[in-house]
């Protein structure tokens, strides 16, 4: 029917030619100068989240798109004006010629043109939508860029402060080292002086020894006389002692035993007559070093030395190896008695360990180990347990065989991770194991689904953080 042929004329305008009978109609339409097709590589539909475009590039593209939009709008307006002008001219011609046949053709052509215009408008709307889509995407990209920039800035600031801290620490350590070197030099000098003094002393002593040897010869002569006198004296002393003991027992048959001043554990405190709960000063075995411990003189016959207590979260248990070694906290509240003391004590004789637990629902349970001891510090205070009984689970929540003790600065667990840093607190971690009574203290209603809480798996499961715990020891023969 109507054969539309599209071609380009010399001035770059689109030319629509319509052949109808003997008449030929040519319409010259203005061209869209800057409009690119959506398939152009210039516009990307994919938002590249992993490798964002450069900021300047994005701005440039945005400007290009804005120009295209403006040109399209202008072109549309030109097209409308052009069609209206042409229509007017054609209508005047048709009226003048008054050829009815041609009028019909013109109306048909007009309709076609209008359809074409509508089609162009639709295409432009699509282009406009695409442009808007692109703009939105670019805005998103820009937002992502600014966010990642902020993130990077924060990271840089954090790293800078970390570097500053390390530098401070470094300079502090350097000063310390220098001070130690100075001290070392002074000590060396004093040692040298002492050595010289000792040499003088040795030579003096040699001469004194010579004199003494001479005197010994003389003394040997008098020795036999002295021996006799000594024998006589001993006899007299024995007689006096016998007389004294006889007279004392006659006067007072209940001679008061001198009260023991130093105690190794709460069992000794209890046996000395102190049967009230409270804090007592204990002494390290074979030493004068003291430690304060809470003694439970009521539970299960008394004499229990409390080595750990958690009850209210008032003490931070994320402590260093040294602090776990010597003990920390408040003996009348939350505290850790100290690995060194417990190790020395439990290697002197056989001890039992009782672990008393409370949950947030008012329930209580315990685990009792009939034999407990800790290895020395050289063996990382490894825990040794035998013979479990009690109500806090049939299986031991302290992994068997016993593990080494680990802290935030002393990683001795069986995990590639650092259990103490991850779960907080010092404990005999496995990898990381079913218990940690030194974990984070969580209050009620915040104590479930907590991987780093106060855990005793075979009683309350893995995510439950307990309300209170007490670890206590007592000699097995108490």
């Amino acid at each position: 029917y109507n054969n539309f042929r599209k071609s380009m004329d010399s001035i770059g305008k689109k030319q629509y030619q319509v052949q109808h009978g003997s008449c030929s109609y040519t319409f010259l339409l203005p061209e869209m100068d800057n409009c690119r097709s959506s398939s152009s590589p210039y516009v990307s539909n994919a938002v590249q989240r992993d490798a964002p475009l450069e900021y300047d590039d994005s701005v440039q593209r945005l400007q290009v798109l804005e120009n295209i939009m403006e040109n399209n709008t202008q072109w549309l307006m030109k097209l409308e004006n052009y069609i209206q002008d042409n229509m007017k001219k054609e209508m005047v011609e048709i009226q003048q010629n008054a050829v009815q046949n041609q009028t019909a053709v013109m109306i048909e052509i007009g309709t076609n043109l209008l359809n074409q215009t509508a089609e162009q408008t639709r295409k432009l709307t699509d282009v406009e939508a695409q442009v808007l889509n692109q703009t939105t995407r670019l805005e998103l990209q820009l937002l992502e860029h600014s966010l990642s920039t902020n993130k990077l800035e924060k990271q840089i600031l954090d790293q800078t402060s970390e570097i500053n801290k390390l530098q401070d620490k470094n300079s502090f350590l350097e000063k310390k080292v220098l001070a130690m070197e100075d001290k070392h030099i002074i000590q060396l000098q004093s040692i040298k002086e002492e050595k010289d003094q000792l040499q003088v002393l040795v030579s003096k002593q040699n001469s004194i020894i010579e004199e003494l040897e001479k005197k010994i010869v003389t003394a040997t002569v008098n020795n036999s006389v002295l021996q006799k006198q000594q024998h006589d004296l001993m006899e007299t002393v024995n007689n006096l002692l016998t007389m004294m003991s006889t007279s004392n027992s006659a006067k007072d048959p209940t001679v008061a035993k001198e009260e023991q001043i130093s105690f190794r554990d709460c069992a000794e405190v209890f046996k000395s007559g102190h049967t009230t709960n409270g804090i007592y000063t204990l002494t390290f075995p074979n030493s004068t070093e003291e430690i304060k411990a809470y003694c439970d003189m009521e539970a299960g016959g008394g004499g229990w030395t409390i080595i750990q207590r958690r009850e209210d979260g008032s003490v931070d248990f994320q402590r260093t190896w040294k602090e776990y070694k010597v003990g920390f906290g408040n003996p009348s509240g939350e505290y850790w008695l100290g690995n060194e003391f417990v190790s020395q004590l439990t290697n002197q004789q056989r001890y039992v360990l009782k672990i008393h637990l409370k949950d947030w629902e008012g329930n209580e349970a315990y685990s009792l180990y009939e034999h407990f001891y800790l290895s020395s510090e050289e063996l990382n205070y490894r825990i040794h347990l035998k013979g479990l009984t009690g109500t806090a689970g049939k299986i031991s929540s302290i992994s068997q065989p016993g593990n080494d003790f680990s802290t935030k600065d002393g990683d001795n667990d069986k995990c590639i991770c650092k259990c103490s840093q991850m779960l907080t607190g010092g404990w005999w971690f496995d990898a990381c194991g079913p218990s940690n009574l030194n974990g984070m203290y969580y209050p009620q209603r915040q104590n479930t689904n907590k991987f780093n809480g106060i855990k005793w798996y075979y009683w309350k499961g893995s995510g439950y953080s307990l309300k209170a715990t007490t670890m206590m020891i007592r000699p097995a023969d108490f």
Epitope: T288, E289, D312, S314, V315, G327, G329, N330
Partner: antibody, heavy 121, light 108 residues
Framework: QVQLVESGGGVVQPGRSLRLSCAAS????????MHWVRQAPGKGLEWVSL????????YYADSVKGRFTISRDNSKNTLYLQMNSLRAEDTAVYYC??????????????WGQGTLVTVSS | EIVLTQSPGTLSLSPGERATLSCRAS???????LAWFQQKPGQAPRLLIY???NRATGIPDRFSGSGSGTDFTLTISRLEPEDFAVYYC?????????FGGGTKVEIK
Amino acid sequence: QVQLVESGGGVVQPGRSLRLSCAASGFTFSSYGMHWVRQAPGKGLEWVSLIWYAGSNKYYADSVKGRFTISRDNSKNTLYLQMNSLRAEDTAVYYCARGPLRYFDWPSDYWGQGTLVTVSS
Amino acid sequence: EIVLTQSPGTLSLSPGERATLSCRASQSFSSSYLAWFQQKPGQAPRLLIYGASNRATGIPDRFSGSGSGTDFTLTISRLEPEDFAVYYCHHFGTSPLTFGGGTKVEIK
């Protein structure tokens, strides 16, 4: 028998300095933290400063921060309080008191008899 | 800073009577960080109670402590002549350590 004996008190003019000492005996001095606590005439007790057993950590009341310095010499079993830029309100009896054992938290269980510091022009 | 307020300021009682001294804290803290001291004129303070309720070595059982959170109490069940003195509550958990203003227990 735990004993704490303070010395170094006396009359001093405002702005001047004074150094108090506290000689300790009857316990392992190097294992215990030590406090200075003061009491103005007719008034209540006011905590001044605390030093840890090894001297690594020191704490001060806001009223003396920047002016007073606590220190110790474990080889001599002695605690010190260096008081600079003294003010009239620093007039008090200064007590030396035994504090916590190593990292344990513990109230002052043994006190000295105190030394009087009078700041007056 | 934890501020400790003691009441009453002065308590006038006769020997044999019961004394109840109050100590209120400006914010809640663990009772294991509360202590009570007794001070007589011209003498150094003496530790009576630690951990809010534990008697120190050598302290008679007529002295007892209780309380938690922000409200603490020292009770002397039957006053003896030697008990007339000033009593201080003391918080030793965090720096700065603080003392209450004191309660004077005097003979009526």
